[in-house]
């Protein structure tokens, strides 16, 4: 079981006094309704809190919202509702915060039914001041900032118009009508789908994909017969209807839609779907739904072109379109992903990959843990992680798995130990090595967060009763101390810390309920005095990621290189600090066949690492073509796994073959593409 507060734990001296001096209460002059919170910028300390209260009347809903601002990480708040003229803000649009440290904020107001357009409040000084702007349209979506220029905004209207602003929402221009979906690409490019006849729903599968690179001055049709499209990393994906039937197929472009290639993926029918699970500039994880209402599909991983796909994981749990999947990128260690599969007996099991989808395995049973009732063999079982699916099923799981890039190796999650996910009350488990090994961290469900790049972990018990105790650990969850942050318990609603896990402040949100009133209240605790000194060189130790067998010459090699990290010693109670940068040292590994995937036209026979040519491509479900400037495909049968950096060692050179004769497809070719000017 998890270590508790005992003599074995290195207690932080005088922590009660230190935390008491750094606990800040703020009672909001508000009736309980809903509250949303946003950080404005990085390391600015600015938080905006929007409270909304609905009173459903017979004919209409009367609403009231209040806006509060903090510039000290939530220790103090100021009511700034007057800056937005006491207007009711629409919570479904949230607070649109500008990219990086632009200091921009857009709030969308509720307007009366008869008005010509909507209303927004804009700030470009971290919410110190707001400007009211009346819109010439009613927004359907939140304002979307261009990632490259925060002055450029786009929005869809309730009448399917695509509206663009070049001066941070001051002036708006409708650049296209009949638009279903619009997204910013790179370099201020906008991609969008349009319908010609009826509506977005009626024309699904007959939409056109358009692109504008000059904010609507000119357009280019880059795809037809489109069902939907998506962006991931440097890839643009379109799901395209087949000529002959109602199936559709994924096409991919790496040049913003100028040229397309058919992805070597199965086609899907009307009831099925594709989903980009994760993508970066190297590769993509794609989920392809199974036919029928199975609730599962197959994960495929792509090559560096996004064209050739290898089957990665069967029976991957993903409920119907827009539903739930447990697919989680473990951001604290390169190459690690966790997800769930639906086994033949309909139980749900957790799987983990350490090599970007190359191989999947069960999670190792935590040390000193016992297998639960789901296990056939009481000595052999594994850890199963609760994620989005469990939360959607209303299991007693308050939080999804948590990892942070700057808290190397740390993964925290709710789980159970057995043969499958259990519906019993879960415990909280922690891994300090990116998911290879696990230990029970806390008994029962908790909310948790990582502070100071892993230097502190904070947790609050998930309970239906009011709470007044917070737990914290300075040694990656081995030992815990408890701190009573208020005499009067509150109904807890959420734990908030600045995104990025660099902060040392945590805000506990909740409400107090007396006989007649309920009020929002927040407690912000600053842990700076717990971690009194700055960490020095002696506080860190060297750790090799992905190490499984030190006797193996290539121990730690994943995707062609191994990485050593400087990690905080568990016994060191010190501040990593806001400017902490993960220190790592990569070293290149020798290549083996494991570093290559089979190119199009080749496959790996079971239990063989060599790629063998497929006897006949034609008639295969998995076929693809390359369109564009290069009209033939040459391959040596192997292709380096995306992101793999190995050198030397095995170099599988094969005779180059021209496979163009074996290729057929039906997607838009360059000569069919047309350009239009506005």
């Amino acid at each position: 079981s998890a270590p508790g507060e005992d003599e074995e734990c290195g207690r932080v001296r005088d922590f009660v006094a230190k935390l008491a001096n750094n606990t800040h209460q703020h009672v909001f002059d508000d009736l309980r309704g809903s509250v949303s919170l946003s950080w404005v910028g990085d390391s600015t300390g600015v938080i905006l809190v929007l409270t909304t209260f609905h009173v459903p009347l017979v004919i209409m809903t009367f609403g009231q919202s209040k806006l509060y601002r903090s510039e000290d990480y939530g220790k103090n708040f100021k009511d700034i509702t007057d800056l937005i003229n006491n207007t009711f803000i629409r919570t479904e649009f949230g607070m649109a915060i500008g990219p990086e440290n632009s200091g921009k904020v857009v709030l969308t107001a509720e307007v009366s039914g008869g008005s010509r357009g909507g209303r927004i409040f804009r700030s470009s000084d971290f919410a110190k001041n707001f400007v009211q702007t009346d819109l010439p349209f009613h927004p359907l979506t939140q304002m979307m900032y261009s990632p490259q220029n925060s002055d450029y905004l786009l929005a869809l209207s309730t009448e399917n118009g695509l509206w663009v602003s070049k001066n941070f929402g001051g002036k708006w221009e409708e650049i296209h009508k009949a638009v279903c979906l619009a997204k910013w690409g790179s370099d201020n490019t906008i991609f969008f789908t349009t319908y010609a006849n009826g509506s977005c729903k009626a024309d699904l599968g007959a939409l056109e994909l358009w692109r504008t690179s000059d904010l609507g001055k000119s357009f280019k049709t880059i795809g037809v017969k489109i069902y939907s499209f998506g962006l991931g990393g440097r890839f643009l994906f379109a799901s395209v209807m087949a000529d002959k039937d109602t199936t559709r197929r994924i096409h991919v472009s790496t040049d913003q839609g100028d040229t397309w290639s058919m992805a070597q993926l199965p086609s899907v029918g009307q009831e099925q779907f594709y989903s980009i699970l994760a993508a970066n500039d190297d590769m993509v994880f794609m989920h392809v739904d199974e036919p029928g209402d199975t609730g599962f599909g197959t994960i495929f991983t792509s090559d560096d072109r996004g064209i050739v796909y290898s089957k990665s994981l069967d029976r991957h749990l993903y409920t119907t379109t827009g539903g739930e999947t447990d697919f989680t990128n473990v951001t604290s260690l390169r190459g690690v992903y966790i997800t769930s599969v639906l086994s033949e007996d309909n139980s749900i099991q957790t799987m983990i990959t350490f090599d970007q989808g190359g191989r999947w395995t069960h999670l190792r049973k935590p040390e000193n843990s016992e297998c639960d009732a789901t296990a056939k063999n009481k000595n052999e079982c594994s850890l199963h992680i609760h994620a989005s699916y469990s939360i959607s099923q209303k299991l007693n799981v308050p939080m999804a798995p948590l990892s942070e890039p700057n808290a190397v190796g740390i993964v925290i999650a709710h789980g159970s130990v057995g043969d499958a996910i259990s519906v019993m009350v879960p415990d909280v488990y922690i891994s300090d090595d990116g998911g290879y090994s696990w230990t029970k961290m806390l008994e029962g469900p908790h909310y948790y967060t990582i502070l100071d790049s892993g230097g502190i972990i904070v947790a609050i018990e998930h309970s239906s009763r009011p709470i007044n105790v917070i737990k914290f650990s300075t040694d990656e969850g081995q030992c815990w101390q408890t701190y009573t942050f208020t005499r009067d318990p509150i109904y807890f609603t959420g734990l908030a810390s600045e995104p990025g896990a660099r902060s040392m402040n945590i805000s506990i949100w909740g409400f107090t309920e007396s006989f007649l009133t309920a009020q929002w209240v927040s407690y912000t605790i600053d842990f700076k005095d717990i971690l009194e000194r700055n960490c020095e060189e002696k506080d860190y130790t060297i750790w090799l990621a992905h190490s499984t067998d030190p006797e193996d010459y290539e121990d730690g090699c994943i995707l062609g290189y191994k990485e050593q990290f400087l990690r905080l010693r568990k016994s060191s109670v010190c501040q990593n600090g806001r400017d902490y940068v993960v220190t790592k040292q990569p070293s290149i590994c020798l290549c083996s066949l494991e570093d290559f995937l089979c190119d199009f036209g080749y496959y790996r026979p079971e239990n063989d690492s060599k790629c063998v040519e497929q006897p006949e491509l034609k008639g295969h479900d998995l076929e693809f073509c390359l369109y564009g400037r290069e009209e033939h495909l040459t391959t040596n049968g192997y292709r380096k796994i995306p992101g793999d950096k190995c050198q030397g060692g095995v170099n599988p050179v094969r005779e180059v073959k021209d496979l163009k004769k074996k290729c057929t497809s039906n997607f838009l070719s360059p000569e069919k593409q047309n350009s239009k000017s506005n």
């Epitope: 734990c9 190490s547 193996d552 730690g556 016994s571």
Partner: antibody, heavy 124, light 106 residues
Framework: QVQLVQSGAEVKKPGSSVKVSCKAS????????ISWVRQAPGQGLEWMGG????????NYAQKFQGRVTITADESTSTAYMELSSLRSEDTAVYYC?????????????????WGQGTTVTVSS | DIQMTQSPSTLSASVGDRVTITCRAS??????LAWYQQKPGKAPKLLIY???SLESGVPSRFSGSGSGTEFTLTISSLQPDDFATYYC????????FGGGTKVEIK
């Protein structure tokens, strides 16, 4: 079976330097940290520092910082410890030892293989 | 640096005795503690790592326990070959050794 073989005994004058070598055979030298530990006559064990051959990451005990340099040559599977500004108190047996490793942490599992020791005598 | 205090410094015992040596760390080191045996003129030999894990090839009469700041090495039934000096060593800070415990014949 992994073995660590150290260079022979040395007699040095105060103020000079000594460089002791430690050659590994029969194992994957690069994947383990090598520590250097000394023992003065009739005294206990004292850790001086260690090195990880991959990347050459060295770290030193505060007491020896600035006076000791630990290096490793992966191609010959050899670690070296150089101690400068020698004084009579540096007279000791110097051991190299491999840090056992069960996980990615290099220094947490004790020293499972030791060299035979090198006697360094500092005398004028 | 973390200080390691070993006690007793000398211990007289007879063959067959149960022997206990303790080691205290100046701050919590979790379970990152090792125990060594050293005989005159020889290099130390690893007995226990991670506070309680027995190194392969070490007789099962040796056992380790503890975590945090208090640790114990126990020899359940002292054998003639066990008369030696024993050292604890912490590994969670820059490595430091305890002062040693000499187990001699009573």
């Amino acid at each position: 079976q992994v073995q660590l073989v150290q260079s022979g005994a040395e007699v040095k004058k105060p103020g000079s330097s000594v460089k002791v070598s430690c050659k590994a055979s029969g194992g994957t030298f690069r994947n383990y940290a090598i520590s250097w530990v000394r023992q003065a006559p009739g005294q206990g064990l004292e850790w001086m520092g260690g090195i990880i051959p991959i990347g050459g990451w060295a770290n030193y005990a505060q007491k020896f910082q600035g006076r000791v340099t630990i290096t490793a040559d992966e191609s010959t599977s050899t670690a070296y410890m150089e101690l400068s500004s020698l004084r009579s108190e540096d007279t000791a047996v110097y051991y190299c030892a491999r840090q056992g490793r069960k996980t990615g942490y290099y220094y947490y599992y004790g020293m499972d293989v030791w060299g035979q020791g090198t006697t360094v005598t500092v005398s004028s | 640096d973390i200080q390691m205090t070993q006690s007793p410094s000398t211990l007289s015992a007879s063959v067959g005795d149960r022997v206990t040596i303790t080691c205290r760390a100046s701050q919590s080191i979790s379970s990152w503690l090792a125990w060594y045996q050293q005989k005159p003129g020889k290099a130390p030999k690893l007995l226990i790592y991670k506070a309680s894990s027995l190194e392969s090839g070490v007789p099962s009469r040796f056992s380790g326990s503890g975590s945090g700041t208090e640790f114990t090495l126990t020899i359940s039934s002292l054998q003639p070959d066990d008369f030696a000096t024993y050292y604890c060593q912490q590994a969670d800070g820059h490595i430091t050794f305890g002062g040693g415990t000499k187990v001699e014949i009573k």
